[in-house]
């Protein structure tokens, strides 16, 4: 198996969960 490492250039050391809804629901079917 392979191993790879990723490094973000973002300087914050705390992952921001702010890009995702806190209590998401499924998208409605239209």
């Amino acid at each position: 198996s392979e191993t790879t490492t990723g490094t973000s250039s973002n300087s914050s050391q705390s992952t921001s969960n702010s890009g995702l809804a806190p209590n998401p629901t499924n998208a409605t079917t239209k």
Epitope: G6, S8, N10, S12, Q13, S14, T15, S16, N17, S18, G19, L20, A21, P22, P24, T25, N26, A27, T28, K30
Partner: antibody, heavy 115, light 112 residues
Framework: EVKFEESGGGLVQPGGSIKLSCAAS????????MDWVRQTPEKGLEWVAE??????????YYAESVKGRFTISRDDSKSRVYLQMNNLRTEDTGIYYC??????WGQGTSVTVSS | DIVMTQTPLSLSVTIGQPASISCKSS???????????LNWLQQRPGQSPKRLIY???KLDPGIPDRFSGSGSETDFTLKISRVEAEDLGIYYC?????????FGGGTKLEIK
């Protein structure tokens, strides 16, 4: 410095299983919502699964295409997130990225499902 | 699923000139808490994606302020005020409002 190190990718036969692992460092892992996202030339970026933190009772979410076949889990004591992939299909082939709620990303590990 | 549609598919920009990418969602991305979970990601050649912007217009730490995001509901735009050589790559919009999270098909930015 934040690092996400993925491992476990490789070649597997259709119907087979594989377990991916992602080790995080330099980040407050226990508070991070962790996702797996895959990338293929055909479908582009495709979200696979997510596991949230202790505060949200480690709730998990899955894409419909992997529900019942894939299981996401985490070990906060080791700052690791896992993706157990069972009953693999050729369409599961791709580069699998571990990401902290789309904020920090690993470099990806390649999974090829082929006979 | 919410479908994210990006335009153009690709664009070629001279260094120092502005660039603009559009992203349209098939449903409103406004969440019940009043926030809109629209993200922009950059993927440089041979690298993994990196988030630039979250919640439509908030820049992630370390992202140059030449990047900006705007829009609401179903219509969003990523702007680069002055393109630099390091900006080449593919840009994706991604919604985090409704499951499953979905991505746009990408816009390839090339340098003239």
């Amino acid at each position: 410095e934040v690092k996400f190190e993925e491992s476990g990718g490789g070649l597997v036969q259709p119907g087979g299983s594989i377990k991916l692992s992602c080790a995080a460092s330099g980040v407050t892992f226990s508070e991070a919502w962790m996702d797996w996202v895959r990338q293929t030339p055909e479908k582009g970026l495709e979200w696979v699964a997510e596991i949230r933190d202790r505060e949200t009772k480690y709730v998990t979410y899955y894409a419909e295409s992997v529900k019942g076949r894939f299981t996401i889990s985490r070990d906060d004591s080791k700052s690791r997130v896992y993706l157990q992939m069972n009953n693999l299909r050729t369409e599961d082939t791709g580069i699998y990225y571990c990401t902290g709620a789309m904020d920090y990303w690993g470099q990806g590990t390649s999974v090829t499902v082929s006979s | 699923d919410i479908v994210m549609t990006q335009t153009p598919l690709s664009l070629s920009v001279t260094i120092g000139q502005p660039a603009s990418i559009s992203c349209k969602s098939s449903q409103s991305l406004l969440y019940s808490n009043g926030k809109t979970y629209l993200n922009w990601l950059q993927q440089r050649p041979g690298q993994s994606p990196k988030r630039l912007i979250y919640q439509v217009s908030k820049l992630d730490p370390g992202i140059p302020d030449r990047f900006s995001g705007s829009g609401s509901e179903t219509d969003f735009t990523l702007k680069i005020s002055r393109v630099e050589a390091e900006d080449l790559g593919i840009y994706y919009c991604m919604q985090g409002t409704s499951l499953p999270w979905t991505f746009g098909g990408g816009t390839k930015l090339e340098i003239k």
